[in-house]
Interface confidence: low
Amino acid sequence: NLSQDDSQPWTSDETVVAGGTVVLKCQVKDHEDSSLQWSNPAQQTLYFGEKRALRDNRIQLVTSTPHELSISISNVALADEGEYTCSIFTMPVRTAKSLVTVLGIPQKPIITGYKSSLREKDTATLNCQSSGSKPAARLTWRKGDQELHGEPTRIQEDPNGKTFTVSSSVTFQVTREDDGASIVCSVNHESLKGADRSTSQRIEVLYTPTAMIRPDPPHPREGQKLLLHCEGRGNPVPQQYLWEKEGSVPPLKMTQESALIFPFLNKSDSGTYGCTATSNMGSYKAYYTLNVNDPSPVPSSSSTYH
């Protein structure tokens, strides 16, 4: 003896990404010799049994048996969202509802606000915006592998009244380590299923130079050729170098090359040498104390850096 519920159809709610395909499945245990029917939120019949009722090539029959009617809707649009109804024309008519939710895919984010010629310790503010998400997406910021804490995501409804534009800004103080770094804005949304959708902005930071003096060979001896390399770093890279020998007043200016060359070392070359590396961001002076060793093969490391 069948209970009344055996003639009650059942279905399920579905979520689909815009542009994707959704399958609506309706089942019934006892069909009482009646056919199942699917209709859309506008109450237009889509299929009655295996008979197509609406001319829409996106809608196809998947399964039609006395106990099941399944249809697919491809290339789903935001306008397809709503309650779909499965009906069976028993006495009385019984219905089941399937709520179809269409997710709007956020567009690739756009970063604005980058100003070139940032200097060390300047404050940078970047803005990020992504349109087309439904529900509203969330934006996150990172610098390399480090998360940046931006403003909370702001949400604005798009003109279509269905999707949203989200925006966020981040402000941070730049350091010399940030020169060449990529600031990344990522959009997080269920429609992306974990896929990365992000935009990066590479930043350039101008900073004062540093320098160090490197001897070649490391342990110079009398009679050897010696090169003192003044290795400058900075942005921009130092273009101007000035070598001086300390101890004389004024200091003896020797060369404006980045390397100071001693073709044949003498004891008299011993002393403290300074290299000033200059860019348009400033100058930096490195020192090196040269102690010219005897020409014997005994290892020594009396040359010192400062």
Epitope: M212, E231, A286
Partner: nanobody, 124 residues
Framework: QVQLVQSGGGLVQPGGSLRLSCAAS????????RGWFRQAPGKEREFVAA????????NYADSAKGRFTISRDNSKNTLYLQMNSLRAEDTAVYYC?????????????????WGQGTLVTVSS
């Protein structure tokens, strides 16, 4: 003369963490800069990170920024490299190094003393 003795390498899964240590003996440790370098199989030795004599200034390779932290404890004459979010491409022999200078260098040629190296393998 400075002797540098390393410890702390090993096998770690991707995403894991390791801490390398480098104990120095000999010349006063605190007066000089220190650095970490690494050498992957078949590749040249490359700069990872450096720290100045006071610990107040650090410098990192792009590949290490945000994931690795260099630090030093002058009271223990020890240099450290904390490595987080490790990736397969971090697999290498890691070396600590000391230049005969107070300034950190980014060039292997600027370092006079080297540790024995410790193997870090990142694999699942």
């Amino acid at each position: 003369q400075v002797q540098l003795v390393q410890s702390g390498g090993g096998l770690v899964q991707p995403g894991g963490s390791l801490r390398l240590s480098c104990a120095a003996s000999g010349r006063t440790f605190s007066n000089y800069a220190r650095g970490w370098f690494r050498q992957a199989p078949g590749k040249e030795r490359e700069f990872v990170a450096a720290i100045d004599y006071s610990g107040g200034s650090t410098n990192y390779a792009d590949s290490a920024k945000g994931r690795f932290t260099i630090s030093r404890d002058n009271s223990k004459n020890t240099l450290y490299l904390q490595m987080n979010s490790l990736r397969a491409e971090d697999t290498a022999v890691y070396y600590c190094a000391a230049p005969a200078s107070r300034r950190p260098s980014w060039d292997a040629d600027g370092y006079d003393y080297w540790g024995q190296g410790t193997l870090v393998t990142v694999s699942s």
